[in-house]
Interface confidence: low
Amino acid sequence: QEGKFSGPLKPMTFSIFEGQEPSQIIFQFKANPPAVTFELTGETDGIFKIEKDGLLYHTRVLDRETRAVHHLQLAALDSQGAIVDGPVPIIIEVKDINDNRPTFLQTKYEGSVRQNSRPGKPFMYVNATDLDDPATPNGQLFYQIVIQLPKINNVMYFQIDNKTGAISLTPEGSQVLDPIKNPYYNLVVSVKDMGGQNENSFSDTTSVDITVRENIWKAPEPVEIRENLTDPHPIKITQVQWNDPGAHYSLINKEKLPQFPFSIDQEGNIYVTQPLDREEKDSHVFFATAKDENGKPLAYPLEIRVKVIDINDNPPTCLSQVTVFEVQENEVLGSSIGIFAAHDMDEANNINSILKYRLVDQTPKVPSDELFLIDEYGGKVQLGKRSLKKQDSPQYNLTVEVSDIDFKTLCSLQVNVIDINDQIPIFERSDYGSKTLSEDTAIGSTILIIQATDDDEPFTGSSKILYKIVQGDTEGRLEVVTDPMTNTGYVKIRKPLDFETEPVTSIVFKAENPEPLVNGIEYNASSFASFELTVTDVNEVPVFPQQIFQANVSEDTAIGTKVGTVTARDPEGLTVSYSLKDNKRGWLKIDSVTGDIFSTAPLDRETESVYRVQVVATEVGGSSLSSTAYFHLVLMDVNDNPPRLAKDYTGLFFCHPLSAPGSLIFEATDDDQQSVRRPKFTFALGRESLQSDWEVSKINGTHARLSTKHTRFEEQVYDIPILINDGGQPPMEGIVSLSVTFCQCVDGSCFRPAGNQVGIPTVGM
């Protein structure tokens, strides 16, 4: 059959599975006169033969692991043995079968992990190799934990990345592992080829011994420091320590102080750097962080709490220059005149701020000294001997000594003797009629003026009038302010009026004195007055319980998923209808009746990490008033972006001919959120046929090296496809291409004759 199994001499490629018995011919080449016979040369390895009549065949089983590609040359010879056609390249590709077992590089691995390590963060790797072709399932390895010892209640504390062999803690392991309880674990890990998906796959196992080590990165106990220390500063107050040497420590001050009075050294010792003042700040909270040599945090910061302990460094102080009390002429022995108070800046409810009061002087001393008493700790001032008379003295000046355990302060107290309070306040009108106000009347507005009079001694507590609302204002929407000169009462709005809850109210005022009435005199109906307040409705906008609503969803949330709910209430009780504004990407819709918000399109964190829309609530019916709140949809990252090259790598070149194998370095990145973990990319050539010429080797999680394997390259441009895998959940693989030009160089740059200047590379390697 011409074409498939026979034909003229020309360059050809054949694919043959390894391990197959040599039972059939590969191809029948036809000789064109004067050619009468053929000659086969190159990498025949004694396996490939050609008969005189052009029959190409192999004599032994092929082994891909010995040679994956055989490069042969075939020539047609005349009867004298001279070449009349060719030689042409004949390539035999040996196709892989799964004839090699995966093998772990070690029969036993040992590793250690700190308790509370982050779940999913690798702390060790196991590695296996398989001689089969990694570009086929035969050489694709799948790692698995087969046994965990001990294993309680079937809970796995360890997990393995089935592609990379990275071992990390599960969330349960991160929480439960405790070196005190059990520091030793053993895993049996298996590796299978065929990606672990075939019952005929080969496997190997290895043993992994894991030691759980204590996590010593812990917040220290709260520290107590006495204020105003006179010892030389800095003074060590506590210490933190990272699990391994070499950490760089620093303090984070969240409280904006003019001077931050703490420091940390590189042993993790924390110092107070200056005396502290409890009266300025009674406690400090700051954070200690540990970072690696690149300035990257090794763990979460630790909270350091410092309590400043009080010392008695403040004397008592008088609350005012003179404190004035009033006492009526007729008051009896023991009557309370008032409570005298001073202040101490030291810590409350502490020995340093407990004050004692003592009367040390009375002027005048008529009719006798010691007319007054003061309670030693309470400060209550009482009549100590008998009733006072204005004719003896209308005023007494007392000196009060206030002391704490170390300091004494003198304060002045003036006691005025006033007429007896035997007259009650009397309202000029008992009924102030009615008034109608709208519910949006401004706070502070005076809505009514009331007046009562009192015939007791003017400008004393016996004649001063205090107005109280004793009925009809349970919500405290009104207040009465008294003019001290005229005793006029101004009724003002203190809180917004509300038609919906109190449309009509009967208000009752009472006029009373700060001084007690004498025995036998009582307030009567003359001291009370009434007033009716009617509130009219103002249509109010719907009210949201908060101005910003927030929901967190994964960016791969299905279209139509409910992502949140926003509600508003109309003060008049009207139905509210909801709509969205500024829905600029059209990602959301809202149920106009319930306020439920749904996704209407694929969400993408890389486009918008927080999607913000306005929600409008509008009254249905009425005057269609509306109000607005914000809905913030926080999109959580999903590994949905393949890796890519971090920058533009056009213009890469090698000078031709290569004098030695060369290499170049490139960097990968991807658009997924990298805050949780640094990228851990793996790199591979994108075509198997490139492996004889090129090699990609990983430098770290983001960088790799592309190297030439020999120096025999043509003077041309090579496009090298490279696969970059991010190892995420799910893993994403990006295919990128590096264009490398092999060119003649002048002064280390590519040389092109004039007129052929298109796309000259600019970077030499």
């Epitope: 309680i152 209640n153 929480q175 439960v176 405790d178 309880k181 967190n552 959580m636």
Partner: antibody, heavy 120, light 105 residues
Framework: QVQLVQSGAEVKKPGASVKVSCKAS????????MNWVRQAPGQGLEWMGV????????GYAQKFQGRVTMTVDKSTSTAYMELSSLRSEDTAVYYC?????????????WGQGTTVTVSS | DIQLTQSPSSLSASVGDRVTITCRAT?????IHWYQQKPGKAPKPLIY???KLASGVPSRFSGSGSGTDYTLTISSLQPEDFATYYC????????FGQGTKLEIK
């Protein structure tokens, strides 16, 4: 079978302290965490803290830090919870609850509860 | 700390009804547990790690959910199921939902 038996009801004045005991039997006391959970009248459950009898390791809920002390007596397989500076809102039923072996956040066995009343 | 909100707070149902109680967390959780409490008694574990039945719990109880939203379902109510149900989040420090009281209609 696993049993947790708690001490009897207590009536305390505001400012006082109360110490509730929880005697464990039917399992190895030091192998399991002991949690304390309280329930005010007509209210829900509130986790107070945990102690690991093997090592004496403790973890308290922020709300009770400074007022609660959890201890164990390994010789009698008894856990204790002491709450100081009592106030009326501490009136509640206090439960001890065993944390399941490998994972102390699942409470598999509970005591019968101890009623503590704080009243002046 | 993570807060849990159960809904409804109370519900009336009849024997044979299918009942669903939900528990919503303020941030994403790996696991949640459910407890049943009868008046004057200590709570009992019902479902742990979202959907696993505690020992001795009938199969009419089931649990599901992920992330922040979890559900307890009783497929056919029995007289002994009238009680208060609590969800509890597994992250330290542990918190409970406010409870759902299931009463006879």
């Amino acid at each position: 079978q696993v049993q947790l038996v708690q001490s009897g009801a207590e009536v305390k004045k505001p400012g006082a302290s109360v110490k509730v005991s929880c005697k464990a039997s039917g399992y190895t006391f030091t192998d399991y965490y002991m949690n304390w959970v309280r329930q005010a009248p007509g209210q829900g459950l509130e986790w107070m803290g945990v102690i690991y009898p093997y090592s004496g390791g403790i973890g308290y809920a922020q709300k009770f830090q400074g007022r609660v002390t959890m201890t164990v007596d390994k010789s009698t397989s008894t856990a204790y919870m002491e709450l100081s500076s009592l106030r009326s809102e501490d009136t509640a039923v206090y439960y001890c609850a065993r944390g399941r072996g490998d994972y102390f956040g699942l409470f598999d066995f509970w005591g019968q509860g101890t009623t503590v009343t704080v009243s002046s | 700390d993570i807060q849990l909100t159960q809904s409804p707070s109370s519900l009336s149902a009849s024997v044979g009804d299918r009942v669903t109680i939900t528990c919503r967390a303020t941030s994403s959780l790996s696991y949640i547990h459910w407890y049943q409490q009868k008046p004057g008694k200590a709570p009992k574990p019902l479902i742990y790690e979202i959907s696993k039945l505690a020992s001795g719990v009938p199969s009419r109880f089931s649990g599901s959910g992920s992330g922040t939203d979890y559900t307890l379902t009783i497929s056919s109510l029995q007289p002994e199921d009238f009680a208060t149900y609590y969800c509890q989040q597994w992250n330290y420090p542990f918190t409970f939902g406010q409870g759902t009281k299931l009463e006879i209609k």
